[in-house]
């Protein structure tokens, strides 16, 4: 990526990292408002299978791992990409490498949610207050879990699937940070490990990932008043370990690998009329990228 | 029942390329992390590749990274690994093999497929 | 990368003995260690995952245990078709290794 300044835009579509081949550094952001696409300052080590969010403006990448020719080593860093700058800075590392990490932002605050280190499955789950820059661990999770969809609503973090060692899971389950305690919530209706998981309009969406046999076009919600699973419209492409976030009231999933081919295909999901259409490319094909939305 | 069936092997000439296939009967590939595994004439096994099915990265022993690439076609059920800048160290047998768990060891092999390089 | 040392490297013995295989991990690798099998121009075959797992269709009289770096194999009572060479993996961390190989012969 280049090194200048980033131009001063609004809310844009950050993708960090992937995999093709070797774990990447790209950093690029798609504008939806005329989709262009910037190439932006590199991650400072190459890193695929990690998690993006963003808190106060500035994004982070956290976990993954470096696959490169050299070797393969899991991460447990945690980076944060300042937009106005167009630069990135190492923040405190997590307890332990998280490769196929979740993440997700209550108050501030960051929860790393599983992933894996070696063939260890995390269950446990850490928090970090980038105001002290530390990491504190809080209550495990119930079931271990990699490739793990989490997304938070109502100030509640849910995590959604995943792969325990064994078995691709559909099993979900939904921590409250007042108890400090993770409850199971209705299962899916199916299995679904590196799926995309998001929040939309109350509900949590799941889109595509894989069951254990093949890749997923299909998509499901929970809607957290009903307590149950509901399929929508599938996405025009299989995929597993994609990118998700929400813009604008619309879902947007880019890449991803169907069981052959790395995508480069970016879909967005309108929810009113219930149908996926393909909106650009990502300027290569890659799975395991971290996705995040700039905030207004 | 099970079964992985790999081909493609022979003699090839130092610098020279191979493309092995592992194909699989009664089970499907995509179910399963595929790796190759070698063993020269008279030794013991050596793990040379891996790909992930759910993510599709791959993993290389340093002593193959940049000369092997192992891949998938889950619609053939087969998977592969091309052979590139081969050297008189790489003669062996070659195996492929199904790994259902991250813990687990290789509970589906397949017969092997000889691989000489000499000139 | 870890080492897997295994010993012995041969070892002769007689149907009906109990017969013990050592490999040990030049680090934690906690229990992700199988055990194989291999008969001469034959392909590996797995007997032991986890490092204590009986798998499908082996017979009971093999068994895995660990003490920390430690991992044995162990054949209760050697059946003629148990002469063979036996090899640990580790796939705790990248890359995967195996030990150098056990070739248990008749006495």
């Known amino acids: 990526g280049s090194m200048g300044h980033a131009p001063k835009v609004g809310r844009l579509i950050y993708t960090a990292g992937g995999y093709f081949r070797q774990s990447l550094s790209y950093l690029e952001a798609y504008n939806p408002s005329d989709g262009t696409w910037l190439d932006l300052a590199d991650l400072q080590v190459p890193r695929s299978g990690l998690a993006g969010c963003v808190v106060g403006g500035l994004l982070y990448a956290v976990g993954g791992r470096n696959n490169s020719p050299d070797g393969n080593t899991d991460s447990s860093a945690l980076d944060c990409y300042n937009p106005m700058t167009n630069q990135w800075s190492p923040c405190a590392p997590m307890s332990v490498p998280r490769n196929r990490i979740g993440v997700g932002v209550i108050d501030g605050h960051i929860y790393a949610v599983g992933g894996s280190h070696g063939c260890i499955h995390h269950n446990s789950v850490e928090r970090y207050e980038p105001e002290r820059d530390e990491w504190h661990l809080v209550a495990p999770m119930l079931t271990r879990r990699i490739g793990v969809g989490v997304a938070v609503l109502n100030r509640l973090l849910y995590a959604v699937g995943g792969f325990d060692g064994t078995n691709r899971l559909n099993s979900a389950e939904c921590y409250y940070p007042e108890r400090n305690e993770w409850r199971m919530i209705t299962a899916m209706n199916t299995i679904r490990s590196g799926a995309g998981v998001c929040v939309l309009h109350n509900c949590i969406y799941a889109a595509g990932g894989y069951d254990g046999q093949d890749q997923l076009n299909s998509v499901e919600r929970y809607d957290v008043e009903t307590e149950t699973w509901t399929f929508v419209a599938p996405m025009k492409h299989r995929r597993s370990a994609l990118g998700i976030t929400v813009h604008q009231g619309r879902i947007y999933v880019l890449g991803g690998y169907d069981g052959h081919t790395f995508l480069d295909s970016v879909e967005c999901y309108d929810p009113d009329t219930d149908t996926w259409s393909e909106v650009t490319r990502m300027t290569s094909g890659r799975s395991g990228v971290g996705v995040a939305v700039t905030m207004e | 029942e099970v079964q992985l069936v790999e081909s493609g092997g022979g003699l090839v000439q130092p610098g020279g390329s191979l493309r092995l296939s592992c194909a699989a009967s009664g089970f499907a590939i995509s179910a399963s992390s595929i790796h190759w595994v070698r063993q020269a004439p008279g030794k013991g096994l050596e793990w040379v590749a891996s790909i992930d099915p759910e993510t599709g990265e791959t993993l290389y022993a340093k002593s193959v990274a940049g000369r092997f690439t192992i891949s998938a076609d889950t619609s053939k059920n087969t998977a592969y690994l091309q052979m590139n800048s081969l050297r008189a160290e790489d003669t062996a047998v070659y195996y492929c093999?199904?790994?259902?768990?991250?813990?687990?060891?290789?509970?589906?092999w397949g017969q092997g497929t000889l691989v000489t390089v000499s000139s | 990368d870890i080492q897997m040392t295994q010993s012995p490297s041969s070892l002769s013995a007689s149907v009906g003995d109990r017969v013990t295989i050592t490999c040990r991990a030049s680090q934690s690798v906690s229990s992700a260690v199988a055990w194989y099998q291999q008969k001469p121009g034959k392909a590996p075959k797995l007997l032991i995952y986890s490092a204590s797992s009986l798998y499908s269709g082996v017979p009971s009289r093999f068994s895995g245990s660990r003490s920390g770096t430690d991992f044995t194999l162990t054949i209760s009572s050697l059946q003629p078709e148990d002469f063979a060479t036996y090899y640990c993996?580790?796939?705790?961390?990248?890359?995967?290794?195996f030990g150098q190989g056990t070739k248990v012969e008749i006495k």
């Open positions: 093999a199904g790994l259902l768990w991250s813990w687990g060891g290789a509970g589906s």
């Open positions: 993996q580790q796939s705790y961390s990248f890359p995967s290794t």
